[in-house]
Structure formats: C-alpha cells, structure tokens
C-alpha cells in the first residue's frame, strides 16, 4: 500500500492488498476498503460503472461480468484500486463490438479477458484469413487489444480476439472494423455548366458534383454577396469505399431578372475547402 508523510491525507487501504485478484466463477468477491474518510466503491468495466457506499464490497456469486476495476475513494479524493478477474472458462472475453478507427490513429478492440493466465492473447482474421501484414497491435488483458495506426485498407476488416486455453485456440465474437478516412486533400467540385442565359420565367437548374473520401464532406450552394439559404436537392453514391460522390442540384423554377448573378458551389472538409461558380443571366 502507498506510504505518505505523517499529517498528509493518505489513500484508502484495500484488502486483499494486491493490484490484481483472480476468483473463479460462482465464488465470492469480498473487498474491504479501510479509511476513516471512506466515501464509495466504484466498479468499472466496458459499458458500465457502478457505485457502492458500503466499505465492504461483496458479490456472493461472481460472474464473468463482475470482472473489472474496483476503486475505493475517500473524502480527500484519494483512491486505490484492485482489478478483479472472474475466471469463467465459458466466457473468456467481455466484448463491445462497436469498432471504429480513424485513419492513422490507434483504435481499441474491446475484448478484455476474464482470465489473465491464458496465453497468446492476440487478434485473428475471420474464417481463417490472415490479418494484413502491416497490422500491428498491443494486447492489454484489462482493456482489450490496441490496433496501432489504422490504415484505410483495414476498412470492414473482420477479426476476432483470440487466446490459447489448454492448447486450444478460443475466439471471441466477430468484430468489424469501420475506418473513418482522414481527409488528405480538398474536395473535388465541378459544375454542370459555367454560365446560363435564360429568358424570364424559364427554369434555372444547375448541378454541382462533389467528390471526396467520405460522406462527411460538407457542401452547399451560395449566392455571392447574399446570405439567403438556397433550396437544393441531393443525390449521393458510394462508388466503393472512400469514393463518395454527391450531386447538389439548385433549381429556380421561374427565373426573374433579379435572380441574375453568380452562384457558388462550396465544399469543405477538415483538410480545406474548394468552390466552383456558375453565372446566371436572366433577360426579359
């Protein structure tokens, strides 16, 4: 347990006095927090946190889902933790299959273990397929497996967390990695026609095509020197992964002389912006 100088508040003391505890499924979890200023126990795992205001945390029949970090906090805001593994041969992994990765960033496959003494904790491809050669990962039994520097090529990769138990490979449920691409260029914008000459009362319709790596690209039609919101209609397509196209069509059903002017199709992403213009001249 931590030691501090006399007079200073000290962290609570937990019994049993170890950082990790392994119990068998069905057995009792009994944790005692000793501190004159005891406030609460907090339990954290995957999708939840629970609190307990009793200084003794007792779970009579432990389940795999009781695996997690138990933290005791005192009135000074100081805390101490113990991590409990509830060993259940039938449930080696706790999983949350939501798996998103931002290109070039790390992402966590959430499959913490209920038994830290299994071996070869790693990732495997689905249906026996190998993982991409450049995929690097770091396993952490208490959190899951961190995929380092996600690549665009990993999009929709199917994988399992895997361990060896008694010489056999055990797989978790399937995870599907969804990669959000990093914008590495401005959107590509083009317009159906650069200029229009119309008579009064004729319909003005112009289409802007926006191409980018994802549907997160923003686009809008603007009239130069005007804040008025223009009415536009969208059609969009994914031409395979990371090849997104949107068509934004601006229509004025009955053009008037004062509709004449420059209309700009503007698009932006986190990398930058692009625009293209078309000129409308309406004569009476």
């Amino acid at each position: 347990q931590p030691s501090v100088s006399p007079g200073e508040p000290s962290p609570p003391s937990i019994h049993p006095g170890k950082s990790d505890l392994i119990v068998r499924v069905g057995d009792e979890i009994r944790l005692l927090c000793t501190d004159p200023g005891f406030v609460k126990w907090t339990f954290e795992i995957l999708d939840e946190t629970n609190e307990n205001k009793q200084n003794e945390w007792i779970t009579e029949k432990a389940e795999a889902t009781n695996t997690g970090k138990y933290t005791c906090t005192n009135k000074h805001g100081l805390s101490n933790s113990i991590y409990v593994f509830v060993r259940d041969p039938a449930k080696l992994f706790l999983v949350d299959r939501s798996l998103y990765g931002k290109e070039d960033n790390d992402t966590l496959v959430r499959c913490p273990l209920t038994d830290p003494e299994v071996t070869n904790y790693s990732l495997k491809g689905c249906q026996g397929k190998p993982l991409p050669k450049d995929l690097r990962f770091i396993p952490d039994p208490k959190a899951g497996i961190m995929i380092k520097s996600v690549k665009r090529a990993y999009h929709r990769l199917c994988l399992h967390c895997s361990v060896d138990q008694e010489g056999e490979s055990v797989l978790s449920e399937k995870f599907i990695l969804k990669v959000r691409p990093a914008f590495k260029a401005v959107p590509v914008v083009s317009v159906s026609k650069a200029s229009y000459l119309l008579r009064e009362g004729e319909e003005f319709t112009v289409t802007c095509t926006i191409k980018d790596v994802s549907s997160s690209v923003y686009s809008t039609w603007k009239r130069e020197n005007s804040q008025t919101k223009l009415q536009e209609k969208y059609n969009s397509w994914h031409h395979g992964d990371f090849n997104y196209e949107r068509q934004a069509t601006l229509t004025i059903s009955s053009a008037r002389v004062n509709d004449s002017g420059v209309f700009m199709c503007y698009a932006n992403n986190t990398f930058g912006s692009a625009n293209v213009t078309t000129t409308l001249e309406v004569v009476d």
Partner: antibody, heavy 117, light 111 residues
Framework: QVQLQQPGAELVKPGASVKMSCKAS????????MHWVKQTPGQGLEWIGV????????SYNQKFKGKATLTADKSSSTAYMQINSLTSEDSAVYYC??????????WGQGTLVTVSA | NIVLTQSPASLAVSLGLRATISCRAS??????????MHWYQQKPGQPPKLLIY???NLESGVPARFSGSGSRTDFTLTIDPVEADDAATYYC?????????FGGGTKLEIK
C-alpha cells in the same frame, strides 16, 4: 445504471440558435460514441450525427451538416448539440443515444424544441 | 443513403396472436454475416427502446415473445404471442453505413 439526462423542453424564436445538453452517468463517458436523433411526426426518426468517444471527432448526416454542431465536455460527462438558424422545420424532439456493442442501447428522454415567434 | 421500407404502416392484431413486421433495405446491411439491423419499440411520450440487435439478438430484459430474423436486405420482427402492453410503434434501423437510417415505423394496435 446508465442514464442520459436531457432537459424536457426549449422554446426558441425563429432565426435564433439552441444548445441542448445530454448529461451521461453510470458509465465511462469517454469510452462510448454519442449519437443524436431527431423525431418529428412527419419525418419520423432521423439520425443527425455522432460524436466519437475519446477524440471528439464528429460525423454528420449531410442533411444536418451546417445546421447542427455536436460537442462534448469530458469533465462534466455531457454531450451537447447546437442547432442554429432555427425555423419551424426544426421543431421536433431531439434524443441523444449511447452506442453500445453496435446498437443504440441507451436513450435520453428527449428535448422538445419548439420554434415560435 | 440506405432506405428502409417498413410494412405494414399499421396493423391490428388480436391478443395472444402473432404480429409480424417487415423491414426491407435498399441495399445489403450485412458484413461477414453480421447484419447491422436493429429493432426498437416506441410508446407515446417515451424514447425508443431497443428490442433486437444485429438482426436476431434479443436485448437483455426484453421478453422472449420478441424475435428477429433476416439477412442482407430483408428483415422481420415477430411478436408471438402479442400482449396488451405491446401496443406501440416499431422501427427498424441500420448502422451499416453512414448516414444511419430508420424505417418509417409500424404502428401496432391490439384488438
């Protein structure tokens, strides 16, 4: 127990903006994506967008891009959605929903936004 | 965008009988055998409540009277037997692809 607390109602004037909150408790806020959904009698349920856990990245439905802005305050475990340039078409119930194990497992009670002069 | 079409828009089912609601997607919502399709129940004045996830998995705490089936583009929610408390609107939702989309809803009335 997981809870998402939203204010019951907001009355706002046309042209103004509104920032609604979604206070999360009962789980580690920074570990889960928070989605926002709009519900109107005419359009049904519409996904507005998501703020991703950890880094605060966002992804929007194009229909709401430029209209809605999603943010989060980790210190108070609160997600926010701001809607600007309000019109009568923005009158709706807005829900926050936590994504858990691929699905929207927890929903707030919703904030009724009424746009009226 | 993936369009989800629910049918029927409304149905009335007698107590104790079976209710079947269909949801058709404009394109597949499957990846490697996982169908990213979910079903929600909504009662007036309440938020949607998750019933079925990944097409056929029963959410914890939801009665076994509710079941889901289907893959790729065609999905079904079945309630058997129907109880009085099941009167509500039911929505399908896909999160295979941005933007996530919901079906138009099916209003279930109990006779």
């Amino acid at each position: 127990q997981v809870q998402l607390q939203q204010p019951g109602a907001e009355l706002v004037k046309p042209g103004a903006s509104v920032k609604m909150s979604c206070k999360a408790s009962g789980y580690t806020f920074t570990s889960y994506n928070m989605h926002w959904v709009k519900q109107t009698p005419g359009q049904g349920l519409e996904w507005i967008g998501v703020i991703y856990s950890g880094n605060g990245d966002t992804s929007y439905n194009q229909k709401f891009k430029g209209k809605a802005t999603l943010t989060a305050d980790k210190s108070s475990s609160t997600a926010y959605m701001q809607i600007n340039s309000l019109t009568s078409e923005d009158s709706a119930v807005y829900y926050c929903a936590r994504e858990r194990d691929t699905r929207f497992g927890n929903w707030g009670q919703g904030t009724l936004v009424t746009v009226s002069a | 965008n993936i369009v989800l079409t629910q049918s029927p828009a409304s149905l009335a089912v007698s107590l104790g009988l079976r209710a079947t609601i269909s949801c058709r997607a404009s394109e597949s919502v499957d990846i490697y055998g996982n169908s990213f399709m979910h079903w929600y129940q909504q009662k007036p004045g309440q938020p949607p409540k998750l019933l079925i996830y990944l097409a056929s998995n029963l959410e914890s705490g939801v009665p076994a009277r509710f079941s889901g089936s289907g893959s790729r583009t065609d999905f079904t929610l079945t309630i058997d037997p129907v109880e009085a408390d099941d009167a509500a609107t039911y929505y399908c939702q896909q999160n295979n692809e941005d933007p996530y989309t919901f079906g138009g809803g099916t209003k279930l009335e109990i006779k």
